[in-house]
């Protein structure tokens, strides 16, 4: 439970997570297992620890071996184990079964590849993507954040998709791979002008001054997988982001559901602590695919305090 | 909005055992630490204990050993502790409270009163 | 054990006004991770505590800016820049730097 497969070729940077979390974690010590010699933690190292983190920069055939990290806090010490492989570079095109990652599937209205483990590293866009070692080139391909978009795929698009990025660590440059398959599967689905299920159109709220208070939006776009779809919040008729509260935000990421088979979307605006003038704000849930925009209005009104404990 | 909800107030016979639970709701109670805190007008606030729910791992301050033991269970989200032997100066209201990523005692219960008398 | 310290009875202040209260441990909580492990608690009458400040300095979610925290590895001191009624309560310092962890006697906010 608390092992994890990590593998990366060799004069490339890998860097490893501690498969333990700390609830909190105060301090994370590596190991060698084989040896129990303490990783080190400065960075001239080519191997050494920073944190939650295992840096290989670059890594090398040898380091291949179980890892032993341990997340220590006043009250646990809890101990994972990081089993690494590293790989020597193959001369042909072909990528071996044991340097792939999960495979993933898209259809024609979602075609994201993510580009495997990249989030553990220091990089800046853009990303390169190759498909079957050639690289991806014509207007179909769109290499966004740390995903490639596909437009209009085909079953053709199936295959090995490898992204490249450079690490980049105290001014050194390194190079990272990784290479996941492509699956296409034909969905039926369809998309319509969004309905928004949450709030009601003119919705009054209540809400106590001095609490917290949540406010969910929520809207169904048609069935199967929509390519653009998304729910926000405005106050005032500005995004939340710029009208600079901090006590009211939204929640990160959108969660998505299918309801009956429709695909949902629902963004939560959280205020902390109400205050009076959040009362003569004007709240619009808003809901917009490639149909167009549906904005259903919510007011707060005060609640009088019922007097509880906490 | 996380909430720990805890069993009402108990009254107990001296030498007798009670158990208090805090259920966890809107987060999953193997993900973060569960820790016991005794609250009395003369001591103030005292750390008894915390349990790790993923593991059943506990740890215990030196003054409660042998008098509490907790206890988690994932399938109810629920967090137990077991006070034996009672005593007057057990009379006390207990709080469970759980842990962040970052740090402990993030959020707590709304507490059970104990009173042991005879 | 780590022995926290704090006074039971703040000066009396006025609604508007700042208030602070200081707060010492018997050892330095500054870990070697460069983290001072202090807390601030709240407890209002009647209700359970809560959160303020972690980590010595920084803002517990939802908590208002108005409350500050600063301090040496075994100095602490809780500001609040405009007190207002919602404050009342007694405040508590505690330490998460070891087990087991400990909390002072609380300094009660009064307000004129």
């Known amino acids: 439970k608390f092992s994890k497969q990590s593998w990366g070729l060799e004069n490339e940077a890998l860097i490893v997570r501690c498969p333990r979390q700390g609830k909190p974690s105060y301090t994370v010590d590596w190991y060698y297992s084989q040896t129990n010699k303490s990783i080190p933690t400065q960075e001239r190292n080519r191997v050494f620890a920073s944190g939650q983190l295992l840096k290989f920069l670059p890594a090398a055939v040898a380091d291949s071996g179980i890892y032993t990290c341990i997340v220590r806090s006043p009250t646990f010490n809890r101990t994972g184990y990081a089993n690494v492989t590293i790989y020597k570079k193959q001369s042909d095109c072909n990528v071996p079964d044991y340097l792939m990652y999960s495979t993933v599937s898209g259809s024609e209205k979602n075609s994201k590849i993510y580009c495997p483990t990249i989030d553990l590293y220091n990089w800046t866009a853009p990303l390169e993507w190759f498909k079957n070692c050639q690289a991806l080139q014509g207007s179909r391909y769109r290499a966004h954040k740390s995903f490639l978009v596909i437009d209009n795929v085909m079953t053709e698009d199936a295959g090995d998709y490898t992204c490249k990025f450079i690490h980049n660590e105290n001014g050194a440059n390194y190079s990272v791979t990784a290479t996941r398959s492509f699956t296409v599967k034909d969905e039926q689905g369809f998309s319509l002008f969004p309905v928004i299920g949450a709030p009601a159109q003119n919705e009054i709220k209540e809400v106590e001054i001095g609490k917290n208070a949540n406010l969910t939006c929520s809207a169904c776009f048609g069935k199967g997988t929509q390519f653009l779809a998304a729910v926000l919040w405005q106050l005032n008729g500005t995004k939340i982001t710029d009208f600079g509260e901090p006590r009211i935000q939204q929640e990160e990421g959108q969660n998505q559901s299918f309801s009956n088979g429709l695909a949902c979307l629902d963004m939560v605006l959280r205020i902390a602590d109400v205050k009076e003038e959040d009362l003569l704000l004007q709240y619009d849930c808003l809901a917009l695919n490639l149909h167009g925009l549906r904005r259903h209005t919510v007011r707060l009104s005060r609640k009088n305090p019922i007097d509880h404990h906490s | 909005q996380v909430q720990l909800q805890q069993s009402g107030a108990e009254v107990v016979r001296p030498g007798a055992s009670v158990t208090l639970s805090c259920k966890a709701s809107?987060?999953?109670?193997?993900?973060?630490?569960m820790h016991w805190v005794k609250q009395t007008p003369v001591h103030g606030l005292e750390w008894i204990g915390a349990?790790?729910?993923?593991?059943?791992?506990?740890a215990y301050s030196q003054n409660f050993k042998g008098k509490a033991t907790l206890t988690a269970d994932e399938s109810s989200s629920t967090a137990y502790m077991e006070l034996s032997s009672l005593t007057s100066e057990d009379s006390a209201v207990y709080y469970c409270?759980?842990?962040?990523?970052?740090?402990?005692?993030?959020?707590w219960g709304q507490g059970t009163t104990l009173t042991v008398s005879s | 054990d780590i022995v926290m310290t704090q006074a039971a009875i703040s000066n009396p202040v006025t609604l508007g006004t700042s208030a602070s209260m200081s707060c010492r441990s018997s050892k330095s909580l500054l870990h070697s991770n460069g983290i001072t492990y202090l807390y601030w608690y709240l407890q209002k009458p009647g209700h359970s505590p809560q959160l303020l400040i972690y980590q010595m300095s920084n803002l517990a979610s939802g908590v208002p800016d108005r409350f500050s925290s600063s301090g040496s590895g075994t100095d602490f001191t809780l500001k609040i820049s405009r007190v207002e009624a919602e404050d009342v309560g007694v405040y508590y310092c505690a330490q998460n730097l070891e087990l087991p962890f400990t909390f002072g006697s609380g300094t009660k906010l009064e307000i004129k």
């Open positions: 809107d987060y999953t109670i193997t993900d973060y630490e």
């Open positions: 349990i790790d729910p993923e593991t059943g791992d506990t």
């Open positions: 409270s759980r842990s962040a990523t970052d740090y402990y005692f993030a959020s």
